[in-house]
């Protein structure tokens, strides 16, 4: 059993989640990658790249865009116009078969809340990144990064078991609470 630290990202409705999933290019450069959401115990594949992966050939499925950079060992995931119902646990995986996927670390717990003014994308910007400087408050410090390790609430004592044949991955003691500021 491999223990993963779940990272929590807080967004407002209408914003864009942009993550990068890191992989060993020697192993997985030519593999298909997928973005999945955990629904109960079973993951649901939301989008997957073509095979073989090629640089700068984005795959778009609704509001999700995947762009693989096999030369750099990175998969870029964009989820635009986030909605409250998008909240949940997401993972990048190496997609080998619908029932068999290798999880790329770390899982992301996405929390989407209504904008303070009640309108989607009510922040200055609708795309955003994460602040990188530790902060003693939960205050949003700037649009591109988040305060790593700014705990905005008591981390839940939870364990999520990802159902992938041959391996059980437990997500325990969510400690990396990330506050994501905004930019349009």
């Amino acid at each position: 059993t491999t223990e993963l630290t779940e990272e929590k990202y807080e967004y407002k409705e209408g914003q864009t989640l942009e993550v990068k999933c890191d992989y060993a290019l020697e192993k997985y450069a030519n593999s298909r990658k997928a973005w999945q959401k955990m629904e109960g115990k079973m993951p649901k594949i939301l989008a997957k790249t073509e095979r073989p992966s090629e640089n700068s050939h984005p795959v778009q499925v609704g509001r999700i865009t995947l762009e693989d950079y096999p030369d750099h060992g990175l998969l870029q995931v964009r989820m635009t116009n986030l909605q409250v119902e998008d909240s949940g646990l997401y993972q990048c995986v190496i997609y080998q078969h619908p029932k068999e996927s290798h999880v790329l670390f770390n899982p992301i717990c996405l929390v989407v809340t209504k904008g303070s003014s009640g309108t989607p994308g009510s922040s200055e910007n609708s795309t955003q990144n994460v602040y990188r400087t530790p902060s003693t408050t939960a205050k949003a410090l700037g649009p591109r990064y988040t305060s790593p390790r700014t705990v905005t609430q008591a981390p839940p004592e939870s364990t999520v078991v990802v159902s992938t044949p041959g391996s059980e991955i437990n997500l325990t003691n969510v400690t990396d609470i990330i506050r994501v500021p905004v930019f349009n």
Epitope: G73, N129, R132, Y145
Partner: antibody, heavy 122, light 107 residues
Framework: QVQLVQSGAEVKKPGASVKVSCKAS????????INWVRQATGQGLEWMGR????????GYVQNFRGRVTMTRNTSISTAYMELSSLRSEDTAVYYC???????????????WGQGTLVTVSS | DIQMTQSPSSLSASVGDRVTITCQAS??????LNWYQQKPGKAPKLLIY???NLETGVPSRFSGSGSGTDFTFTISSLQPEDIATYNC?????????FGGGTKVEIK
């Protein structure tokens, strides 16, 4: 405070290799990418690639692929960039720079090492 | 690769002048653009990230704007300590690319 401290200047012969180190302090080393950027005298900045210190996975710009290797030692919070088969045009200042968090699509270089001059001359 | 074209390549202005530098991307990069200041013999220093956000500790006379392919960096009132080369950098797509730099001098 966050600091990146690089190893000293190097003089190398064509065909040799050089390994530059970058020691990080003041933050959690494994939470942020380390990038390498070089600058030849009087020239612009050129990104060479990035490494995720947590996983050790790295990716390189095409111009350098096959010649560059980026590694790390997490126990001493140090990143390394090794460039092999050196030629005169590799003479440049090599910088390490901290990028965004490893899981976020952010390549904003907020802290830089002081630079290491690598001179390639016969 | 995305090409970043900076202009002018150099400029000379008086203390107190408003200085504007432009950076043009060869394709849409949204707001994924950063600006750095580099003084001779020193490492670059982040000034502006994501087009318009001022890095902590950077004087408010520096600002940035733009979106898509056209971006502007402004020094509202040039100071003697602003003598440096300024570089833009995009990170919308890999590989990351920098502009050619703009050298700012005092008249």
């Amino acid at each position: 405070q966050v600091q990146l401290v690089q190893s000293g200047a190097e003089v190398k012969k064509p065909g040799a290799s050089v390994k530059v180190s970058c020691k990080a302090s003041g933050y959690t080393f494994t939470s942020y990418d380390i990038n390498w950027v070089r600058q030849a005298t009087g020239q612009g900045l050129e990104w060479m690639g990035r490494m995720n210190p947590k996983s050790g996975n790295a990716g390189y710009v095409q111009n350098f692929r096959g010649r560059v290797t980026m590694t790390r030692n997490t126990s001493i919070s140090t990143a390394y960039m090794e460039l092999s088969s050196l030629r005169s045009e590799d003479t440049a200042v090599y910088y390490c720079a901290r990028g965004g968090r490893t899981s976020i699509w952010s390549f904003v270089f907020d802290y830089w090492g002081q630079g290491t001059l690598v001179t390639v001359s016969s | 690769d995305i090409q970043m074209t900076q202009s002018p390549s150099s400029l000379s202005a008086s203390v107190g002048d408003r200085v504007t530098i432009t950076c043009q991307a060869s394709q849409d990069i949204s707001k994924h653009l950063n600006w750095y200041q580099q003084k001779p013999g020193k490492a670059p220093k982040l000034l502006i990230y994501d087009t318009s956000n001022l890095e902590t500790g950077v004087p408010s006379r520096f600002s940035g704007s733009g979106s898509g392919t056209d971006f502007t960096f402004t020094i509202s009132s040039l100071q003697p300590e602003d003598i440096a080369t300024y570089n833009c950098q995009q990170y919308d797509k890999l590989p990351l690319t920098f502009g050619g730099g703009t050298k700012v001098e005092i008249k």
